[in-house]
Structure formats: structure tokens, C-alpha cells
């Protein structure tokens, strides 16, 4: 799988030349440039940055760089009518109000256009009522409240702490529980690491810091008004009542200073157990309502945000392949930020910029990759992955026929402890081999490989001597490529030590304090972790675009399919009586997995032996590898989620960020004991086993000898 074979090459034009050209100092400079003002989707500032990136990518040497624009539904606070939450007394007087903005960080006091904290796509409304504390607002939290504690959230305003699951799932759960409003807050237990100072003296969240974010439940639809199709000039748009994924109740985020004031008066039921307690000095009573002296006081929300169809701009750069120009390897990450984007997304965008510069340098010296590389700076990721999804909808026919791989490039860091990789099993061997060739940036691992430090710090739970690689979920721009189109995808970034840091994400995520200084002072002063991430992302793109045989190993898919089949079978076997009653069998699935394993093994043997100098046979074998991921796509999609079409992986129905294996079967089995019609419920389990077994068998057959 040599990388040294593209046309017009001299021996120096190989992976090493590409990697050696990547410089930490450039990434630092680019990050600074991208973070001096806010780049909120749909604003003039973000359009200007798009044009700057277009111009610079052209200078770097790409063959073409175009802007692709779409008119999508976005959401903004009302500038003259701010959002806030009050405690009101029995006369309706506001006796306490939450903040209207975050105190700006030092040096940024005079920056204009800092959007105040808000929950994007919240409807307008001024609900008032008693408060119920719902922990993280996960499915299991509402089960605990409703089933065990017999607490009814209907007509209540719920307050939930951020963390554990995607905020959109929290809102959906609250809606289903009958709540009339949702307050989201950051608890220090999740967003304040012990022993670290709050910003600007450290990387912890100050009391006035607030996490912004969208609260949609799009399930892969993209623009809520044009599901399935690009939001172009002649688009037919749904009415707002028919829009996909919009919340139906007002939602607003606050920091822990304000949360303290709401939670300290809570009465009603005590928390069910210690897992419901955060780190504030409050009782974490569930409610409903305030305690004795304050029982006549209520909470009132004032939400005046508006949804507006707004133009967004992707930047698409092309480096044409010399041998297979109709095969696309895509490197994409978003450009829009909530405020300054010090980590999210600009630590990723700066890395993409340096990767483009390095590829451009090689191209100027006469080199071209074997396959075409597409570079993308996506817009409106923060509003629901809109830019990437609209572009993929517009280009779906090309992508499904020509898409080899998609590598995502959002935040390069969420910590500085070790590498974190989520990818298709097809890329496991690529990632392993690449990281064995890269130097570890970690202290105490001088002269050792990245693979070694990564494996030591984040070992695989199944295979000793190997690092953990996770399933792809969603919440980022790979979603449409992987979950809808079935293009092999992966992502890599540096992460925290999950053992010692139990907070969710990084503390300053989506706050005004996510600045250049946060990264430069506290996370990566030498930009060595950024450089390592650039080497991993860039190295993957280089290999995928340049190796003669695609660096995919289908045997790794066979291994995980068996693991996932075992897991879903054991979940089902928690109901042995029902399985017997309704004749539920997993034989077809295990048989398909066995067939897949045998056929994949034979394919791999042929891959070692075939004549690589025969371009027709080479193309045939590569196409079988490229189309394997595509073979796991069910054109009908998952139940009630038509844009999640991958049968092996989907975002969890309970947490968009997490990946679930055999999601169709998993969802059919979930909480099956509570279903009113068990016969129908188990019938759906059987149908999902059938779909999964058929899909695995069909995918296996794409690897068989063609005739």
C-alpha cells in the first residue's frame, strides 16, 4: 500500500514530505486569525471569513475553490427584546432575573456582535409555572421521575443540567413528558474540574458562563424546511408548522450562578439518589415548586427569539486526482462558531488550513494525489449540520458513486491527554498503521510512537495492546456522509483523561470564553497537539487519496459485526420467555455475520494476490472496498428516521452524540416490557432482525468474486 506512486512524482513526494511540511507555528497563526471576532452562521463576518478562506486556498494552490450557498432556517435572539428567566412573586413582580449576557473576557469588552446565550430554534413564549428538576433530562431520568417517583411534569417548567447527552434529546424528552418550558444549566459537577481555576485564570467555566447550542431533533434532515433536498434558489419550503425537528416549548440556557438562585428554593421530593446531585450548595430537590416560605413564587420564562431563512456559505476546494479523478476523498470541518470559536471549530479549521497549505506546496512542486481530494469549510454546523447536509443533498448522486471517504475536522482538541478516534471499522488498520509512524507529543513518551502513548492511555476494552476506537455517532458534519450516504468516515482529535475528568465535553464549550487565549495559555501552548491532529487527519487523507489499493480492511468489519450481534442478542435474551412465545430467533443474523466473515477473509486473500499492474482489476477491487460501506445502507432508512439509513450504525435515539450498533433492533427492543401490545412489539423486533440479517448478507455478497 505504497503512497509513492502518484504521477509526476519524485521520490520526495510521499507521505513524509506532506507531513514534514505541516508546522505548529502556522496552525497557531491561523487559529489566531480565525478567532478575533465572532463568526456566527448567517452573519456578514462569517461570509467575509468564507471569502478569505476561498482566497487563501487558491493561493495555497488548489485547482479550484468555490462558494456553495444555501438559504436555510436559522435562529437568533431578538436584539431589542432579550431572553431571560424570572422568579416572580404572587403579585407577578419579578424578584430575580437571570443574566442577559456573559461578562466578556478580558480584552474582548469592546467586541460587538457577541450573540447572548440562547437555545437556537426555541419557539417564542412566556410560560410560567412550578419548577421540576429533572437531572440530565435523559430517558432514564424521566423514567425515574414518572415511574418510580410518580412526579408529573405536565404543565411544569423543567430545569435540567447539561451533559451526558445531546441537548436536543433533553428537550424532546421534556416535551414528551408534557413540560411547558425547559431551562438548561451547566452544573459545576460537569463543567468545573477540581483544582483548576475558572477562566481567565484557567480553563474552567465561571459562574456567568453559559453553553449555547441548537435544540433540534433533525435526525439527519438538514435544513428543517427542505428535508432531503438542497435549500437552493428554486427550493420549495415547508411551512414552519411542518418544519422538521423544531421544539414546541420555550428553552433557555443559564450558568451556574443563575441556576443556584433557581435551585436553592426547590422543595417537593428529595433527589432519588446521589447521582442526581451536582456540586452547587443546593438540596437538588426535584420539586415540583419551591419550598414552604417561597411556595407562592413561580418561574417565568421570557423567550423572544426568531427563526429566519438566512444565506449560508460553504467553501469547497478541489485538488484533482491524477489517476482516478472521479474518486473523492473529502476533508471537511465547519467554520461557523457560536462566538469566537477558540476550540469549536477554529482549532479544527486552522488544522484544515495547514493541511491544505501542505498539499498545495506539494502540488506546486509537480505532485498530484492519485484520487481527487475535496476540502470543505462548512457553514451552519452549529444550527444542525446544515451546510454539510445541504451540500451533500445537492451532490448526493456524485457522492454515492464517487465518494471514497470523509474525514471530519471539527475541534482538534477537547483536552490534551491522548488521541481520540471514532471511525468506520474499515479505517481501523489505516489508523493503527498511521499512528505507529507518527511521533507521540505526550510528555513521558519522547521518542515513542503516537500509537504507543495512545494505547497506553486509552486501551481497547476488547483487544490488549491496541487503542480504543469508538463508533461514529452524530452531532458533527460527517453525519450525512456516513449515516445517510454510506461513505466510509472517520474523525480524530486530542481529548481529556475520561478516567479523571468526569465533566461533559470541555468546560468552556460554546461559551464566550472559548478564545484563542484559552488554547494558547491552557490547552496547547506549543501547538504540539494540534500538529499531531493535523498529522493524523492529513495522513489519513493522504493515504486514502494516494495508496494504490484503498487502505480499508473488510475483516475488521467482520469482527465488529460479530461483537454487535452478540451484544444485541444478549439484550434480547433478557426476555427469554417472550422470545420463546413469539419465536424470536437471531439465527439469520449470526448466519449472515458468519458468511460475511468468510467472504471478507477470502476477499482479503485475493487483495494480497491480485495483479496490481492491471488497472481494470485494481479498479474493480477498489470499487468493492469503496462500495462496502454503501452496502450497509437501507434505502428505506430506520423507522421514523428516513435519513439515518445505515443498518449497522446510527446515532442513539436517546443521545445524538452516541453511536448505536444494530440501531433498528436496539430501538425495537428498548423498553419493550412497557409496550401495550407485546405481540406487535416483538413482531417489530423480528422484522428488524430480518432487515439486519439481509443487509449483512447483501453486503457480504458485494465482496464475493464478481463472476
Amino acid at each position: 500500500k505504497s503512497s509513492n506512486e502518484a504521477t509526476n512524482i519524485t521520490p520526495k513526494h510521499n507521505m513524509k514530505a506532506f507531513l514534514d511540511e505541516l508546522k505548529a507555528e502556522n496552525i497557531k497563526k491561523f487559529l489566531y486569525n480565525f478567532t478575533q471576532i465572532p463568526h456566527l452562521a448567517g452573519t456578514e463576518q462569517n461570509f467575509q471569513l468564507a471569502k478569505q478562506i476561498q482566497s487563501q486556498w487558491k493561493e495555497f494552490g488548489l485547482d479550484s475553490v468555490e462558494l456553495a450557498h444555501y438559504d436555510v432556517l436559522l435562529s437568533y435572539p431578538n436584539k431589542t427584546h432579550p431572553n431571560y428567566i424570572s422568579i416572580i412573586n404572587e403579585d407577578g413582580n419579578e424578584i430575580f432575573n437571570t443574566s442577559l449576557f456573559e461578562p466578556p473576557p478580558p480584552g474582548y469588552e469592546n467586541v460587538s456582535d457577541i450573540v447572548p446565550p440562547f437555545s437556537a430554534f426555541s419557539p417564542q413564549g412566556m410560560p410560567e409555572g412550578d419548577l421540576v428538576y429533572v437531572n440530565y433530562a435523559r430517558t432514564e431520568d424521566f423514567f425515574k421521575l414518572e415511574r418510580d417517583m410518580k412526579i408529573n411534569c405536565s404543565g411544569k417548567i423543567v430545569i435540567a443540567r447539561y451533559g451526558k447527552v445531546f441537548r436536543g434529546n433533553k428537550v424532546k424528552n421534556a416535551q414528551l413528558a408534557g413540560a411547558k418550558g425547559v431551562i438548561l444549566y451547566s452544573d459545576p459537577a460537569d463543567y468545573f474540574a477540581p483544582g483548576v481555576k475558572s477562566y481567565p485564570d484557567g480553563w474552567n467555566l465561571p459562574g456567568g458562563g453559559v453553553q449555547r447550542g441548537n435544540i433540534l431533533n433533525l435526525n439527519g434532515a438538514g435544513d428543517p424546511l427542505t428535508p432531503g433536498y438542497p435549500a437552493n434558489e428554486y427550493a420549495y419550503r415547508r411551512g414552519i408548522a411542518e418544519a422538521v425537528g423544531l421544539p414546541s416549548i420555550p428553552v433557555h440556557p443559564i450558568g451556574y450562578y443563575d441556576a443556584q438562585k433557581l435551585l436553592e428554593k426547590m422543595g417537593g421530593s428529595a433527589p432519588p439518589d446521589s447521582s442526581w446531585r451536582g456540586s452547587l450548595k443546593v438540596p437538588y430537590n426535584v420539586g415540583p415548586g419551591f419550598t414552604g416560605n417561597f411556595s407562592t413564587q413561580k418561574v417565568k420564562m421570557h423567550i423572544h427569539s426568531t427563526n429566519e431563512v438566512t444565506r449560508i456559505y460553504n467553501v469547497i476546494g478541489t485538488l484533482r486526482g491524477a489517476v482516478e479523478p472521479d474518486r473523492y476523498v473529502i476533508l471537511g470541518g465547519h467554520r461557523d462558531s457560536w462566538v469566537f470559536g477558540g476550540i469549536d471549530p477554529q482549532s479544527g479549521a486552522a488544522v484544515v488550513h495547514e493541511i491544505v497549505r501542505s498539499f498545495g506546496t506539494l502540488k506546486k512542486e509537480g505532485w498530484r494525489p492519485r484520487r481527487t481530494i475535496l476540502f470543505a469549510s462548512w457553514d451552519a454546523e452549529e444550527f444542525g449540520l446544515l451546510g454539510s447536509t445541504e451540500w451533500a443533498e445537492e451532490n448526493s448522486r456524485l457522492l454515492q458513486e464517487r465518494g471514497v471517504a470523509y474525514i471530519n475536522a471539527d475541534s482538534s482538541i477537547e483536552g490534551n491527554y491522548t488521541l481520540r478516534v471514532d471511525c468506520t471499522p474499515l479505517m481501523y488498520s489505516l489508523v493503527h498503521n498511521l499512528t505507529k509512524e507518527l511521533k507521540s507529543p505526550d510528555e513521558g513518551f519522547e521518542g515513542k510512537s503516537l500509537y504507543e502513548s495512545w494505547t497506553k492511555k486509552s486501551p481497547s476494552p476488547e483487544f490488549s495492546g491496541m487503542p480504543r476506537i469508538s463508533k461514529l455517532g452524530s452531532g458533527n458534519d460527517f453525519e450525512v456522509f456516513f449515516q445517510r450516504l454510506g461513505i466510509a468516515s472517520g474523525r480524530a482529535r486530542y481529548t481529556k483523561n475520561w478516567e479523571t475528568n468526569k465533566f461533559s465535553g470541555y468546560p468552556l464549550y460554546h461559551s464566550v470564553y472559548e478564545t484563542y487565549e484559552l488554547v494558547e495559555k491552557f490547552y496547547d501552548p506549543m501547538f504540539k497537539y494540534h500538529l499531531t491532529v493535523a498529522q493524523v487527519r492529513g495522513g489519513m487523507v493522504f493515504e486514502l487519496a494516494n495508496s494504490i489499493v484503498l487502505p480499508f480492511d473488510c475483516r475488521d468489519y467482520a469482527v465488529v459485526l460479530r461483537k454487535y450481534a452478540d451484544k444485541i442478542y444478549s439484550i434480547s435474551m433478557k426476555h427469554p420467555q417472550e422470545m420463546k412465545t413469539y419465536s424470536v430467533s437471531f439465527d439469520s443474523l449470526f448466519s449472515a455475520v458468519k458468511n460475511f466473515t468468510e467472504i471478507a477473509s477470502k476477499f482479503s486473500e485475493r487483495l494480497q494476490d491480485f495483479d496490481k499492474s492491471n488497472p481494470i482489476v485494481l479498479r474493480m477491487m477498489n470499487d468493492q472496498l469503496m462500495f462496502l460501506e454503501r452496502a450497509f445502507i437501507d434505502p428505506l432508512g430506520l423507522p421514523d428516521r428516513p435519513f439515518y439509513r445505515h443498518v449497522i450504525y446510527a446515532p442513539s435515539s436517546h443521545n445524538k452524540y452516541a453511536g448505536e450498533s444494530f440501531p433498528g433492533i436496539y430501538d425495537a427492543l428498548f423498553d419493550i416490557e412497557s409496550k401495550v401490545d407485546p405481540s406487535k412489539a416483538w413482531g417489530e423486533v423480528k422484522r428488524q432482525i430480518y432487515v439486519a440479517a439481509f443487509t449483512v448478507q447483501a453486503a457480504a455478497e458485494t465482496l464475493s468474486e464478481v463472476a
Epitope: 431571560y84 424578584i95 430575580f96 443574566s99 442577559l100 461578562p103 475558572s198 477562566y199 465561571p206 436553592e264
Partner: nanobody, 126 residues
Framework: EVQLLESGGGLVQSGDSLRLSCATS????????MSWFRQAPGKERELVSA????????FHADSVKGRFTISRDNSWKTLYLQMNSLRPEDTAVYFC???????????????????WGQGTQVTVSS
């Protein structure tokens, strides 16, 4: 860790105005609320006005309501007390205080603030 320095006091006539300032330095991001207290000779220290970290909530004691206004600059570097229609009974040493505590029956009620300035004398003659 938070330093406070008051200024702007002085001798004025009844009915006049004064603007007190309190310059802050140190870890002002940890401050939850800032207050102006006053202590007249032979009397207990009393809370005059308070403002929370965000500026969304302000408190003024009944004795100064409609005459005194508390405010701060955007970067939390300076706290102000605009005092209009001053009366002889407003004569006192005015202290600036900062609290990093969140707890109290109401947001502005703190038994004891964490940080105090040295005070500035305000004298109102009739």
C-alpha cells in the same frame, strides 16, 4: 484575591449629588455580587445598594430608593454609586464590598461579604 479601592467621597450640601467609584482588581470573575454599605458614627453598618454579577438584578434600600443608583462598567473593573438629592442622614463612611458567595434568602443578602474596601467619607451638611 479581590482588591477594592473607593473614591469620590467628600463634603457636600444637602440636595447635592456625588458619584462614588470603587476600582476593582484581582479575580473579579469570581465575584457574584457587589454592594455599597455605609456606617454612620455610632450605628451599625447597613446595606445601601447591591448589583449582581450580570447587572440583571439591583437592590436599593428603601431609605435611598429613587435617589441612589448602583451601576458598573462592562468589564467589572469599576463599581459606581450615583447619589442624588443627598440628605444629612446620608452622612457616613461608604464601603464597597464584593461577595463570591451565592447563598442567601435573596440574591443580595449576604451575612458577610468576602472582600471590603477601606471606605470613603461622605458628609452632607444642612
Amino acid at each position: 484575591e479581590v482588591q477594592l479601592l473607593e473614591s469620590g467621597g467628600g463634603l457636600v450640601q444637602s440636595g447635592d449629588s456625588l458619584r462614588l467609584s470603587c476600582a476593582t482588581s484581582g479575580r473579579t470573575f469570581d465575584v457574584y455580587a457587589m454592594s455599597w454599605f455605609r456606617q454612620a458614627p455610632g450605628k451599625e453598618r447597613e446595606l445601601v445598594s447591591a448589583i449582581d454579577w450580570s447587572g440583571s438584578n439591583k437592590f436599593h434600600a428603601d431609605s435611598v430608593k429613587g435617589r441612589f443608583t448602583i451601576s458598573r462598567d462592562n468589564s467589572w473593573k469599576t463599581l459606581y454609586l450615583q447619589m442624588n438629592s443627598l440628605r444629612p442622614e446620608d452622612t457616613a463612611v461608604y464601603f464597597c464590598a464584593a461577595s463570591t458567595r451565592l447563598y442567601g434568602t435573596t440574591w443580595y443578602e449576604f451575612n458577610d461579604s468576602d472582600y471590603w474596601g477601606q471606605g470613603t467619607q461622605v458628609t452632607v451638611s444642612s
